[in-house]
């Protein structure tokens, strides 16, 4: 029977700036019980505060609701680890809500072939940013990324399409079934999960000559 | 102990590339941006880019872009700073740096000379 | 790309004594979001840079409280109330608002 090892808080997420969780790896339980809480103070305070929230973000988990999330402030944050022979924290963890966000999946993705009379016929895709994220404001710059295959090919194809909310695909194998999804994330955060698929039948007519 | 471990000294031709690595240990790799930063000889200090090792999205200083890429290696806990098209003014002691979830230093590696010479 | 300046170039304290670095920036450091994101290093003689202040005025963890940060917009200050000799290095600002993130060309401290 040991004290417990050393826990490492590894992820924090927020979805839209307002709100974050942060997860913390357990250590070695010393073959014992072993209590986790989690405590911060926020930049140019001193005094401690512990976890507002253990539960919403699940197992290993600190949520901070509405009211205890600033954007203005770093967030200073360890795990301490206690069960009957003692105790052992996590190194301090330094958090700017900025750099965590995670964004949910755009909307209304939308996709067309288009095969005007004079130009080469093209795949048209338009999407919508996710709800919650508030891109008025001017700091939140969201980058799309849009992925593609025919129905039953295991590759996708991949295009990066900056902060544009409008692609156009020229190169389709004409007579296919097409997937197309497509994914966002600010420029310093992390990637939403991809959209819902979109089915897409590529006509048989669809040529790509000149 | 959060260590970020790089590859030794390297002497270049002018014209070749050069990769150096970051090795790092201590926490989990793919949690923090990792960044490269450079100093030439008596001189300060030059941000080269950035990498988020969880997906490997990067973004570099545009006065290297086409000449450096970074990359990272999720199985071994690595990153790699690769700069091609040497010229004598690239040498410099290459560092890499890691962040937290924000957009400063915290840590940094020892440092790796790249000396460029005909 | 922000330049970063700082002034002076190199300082000479005796030990005890207080001292004053200046940092000035070609732009504003306020982020969109509302930050400041002015940070200083620290090289020792042979060493890696070392993290000291980070946005403007907050000390990293294990710093002494002898380093202090202030200032807004363009102009910023470090300011070391007692040097002692394991002050001695180059002293970096750095911004990390705008990409590329940019460091002041460093000020020299050496013990008199």
């Known amino acids: 029977q040991l004290p417990p090892g050393k826990p490492e808080i590894f992820k924090c997420r927020s979805p839209n700036k307002e709100t974050f969780t942060c997860w913390w790896r357990p250590g070695t339980d010393g073959g014992l019980p072993t209590n986790y809480s989690l405590t911060y103070h926020r930049e140019g305070e001193t005094l401690m505060h512990e976890c507002p929230d253990y539960i919403t973000g699940g197992p290993n988990s600190c949520h901070f609701g509405k009211q205890y999330t600033s954007m203005w402030r770093t967030y200073i944050m360890m795990v301490n680890a206690t069960n009957q022979m003692g105790s052992s924290f996590s190194d301090e963890l330094y958090v700017d809500v900025t750099y965590i966000v995670q964004p949910d999946p755009p909307l209304e993705l939308a996709v067309e072939v288009k095969q005007p009379e004079d130009r080469k016929p093209y795949l048209w895709i338009k999407w919508s940013p996710p709800t919650l994220i508030d891109l008025k404001t001017g700091w939140f710059t969201l980058l799309y990324e849009i992925r593609l295959k025919p129905e039953k090919a295991a590759e996708w194809e991949i295009h990066f399409a900056g902060q544009q909310t409008e692609f156009k695909i020229l190169s389709l194998h004409p007579g296919q079934k097409y997937l197309v999804q497509v994914r966002c994330k600010p420029d310093h955060g992390y990637w939403s999960a991809w959209s819902p698929a979109t089915f897409i039948q590529i006509p048989s007519d669809f040529t790509m000559n000149d | 102990e959060v260590q970020l471990v790089q590859s030794g000294a390297e002497v270049k031709k002018p014209g070749s590339s050069v990769k150096v690595s970051c090795k790092a240990s201590?926490?989990?790799?793919?949690?923090?941006?990792i960044h490269w930063v450079r100093q030439a000889p008596g001189q300060g200090l030059e941000w080269m880019g950035e990498?988020?090792?969880?997906?490997?999205?990067?973004n570099y200083n545009q006065k290297f872009k086409g000449r450096v890429t970074i990359t990272a290696d999720k199985s071994t806990s690595t990153a790699y700073m690769e700069l091609s098209s040497l010229r004598s003014e690239d040498t410099a002691v290459y560092y890499c740096?890691?962040?937290?979830?924000?957009?400063?230093?915290?840590?940094w590696g020892q440092g790796t000379l790249v000396t460029v010479s005909s | 790309d922000i330049v970063m300046t700082q002034t002076p170039l190199s300082l000479s304290v005796t030990p005890g004594q207080p001292a004053s670095i200046s940092c000035r920036s070609s732009q504003s450091l306020v982020h969109s979001n509302g930050n400041t994101y002015l940070h200083w290093y620290l090289q020792k003689p042979g060493q890696s840079p070392q993290l000291l202040i980070y946005?403007?005025?907050n000390r990293f963890s294990g710093v002494p409280d002898r380093f202090s940060g202030s200032g807004s917009g363009t102009d910023f200050t470090l300011k070391i109330s007692r040097v002692e000799a394991e002050d001695v290095g180059v002293y970096y600002c750095?911004?990390?608002?705008?990409?590329?993130?940019?460091f002041g060309g460093g000020t020299k401290v050496e013990i008199k």
């Open positions: 990498i988020d090792p969880s997906d490997s999205y990067t």
């Open positions: 750095s911004q990390s608002t705008h990409v590329p993130f940019t």
């Open positions: 201590g926490y989990t790799f793919t949690s923090y941006w």
């Open positions: 946005k403007v005025s």
């Open positions: 740096a890691r962040s937290f979830f924000t957009n400063w230093f915290a840590y």
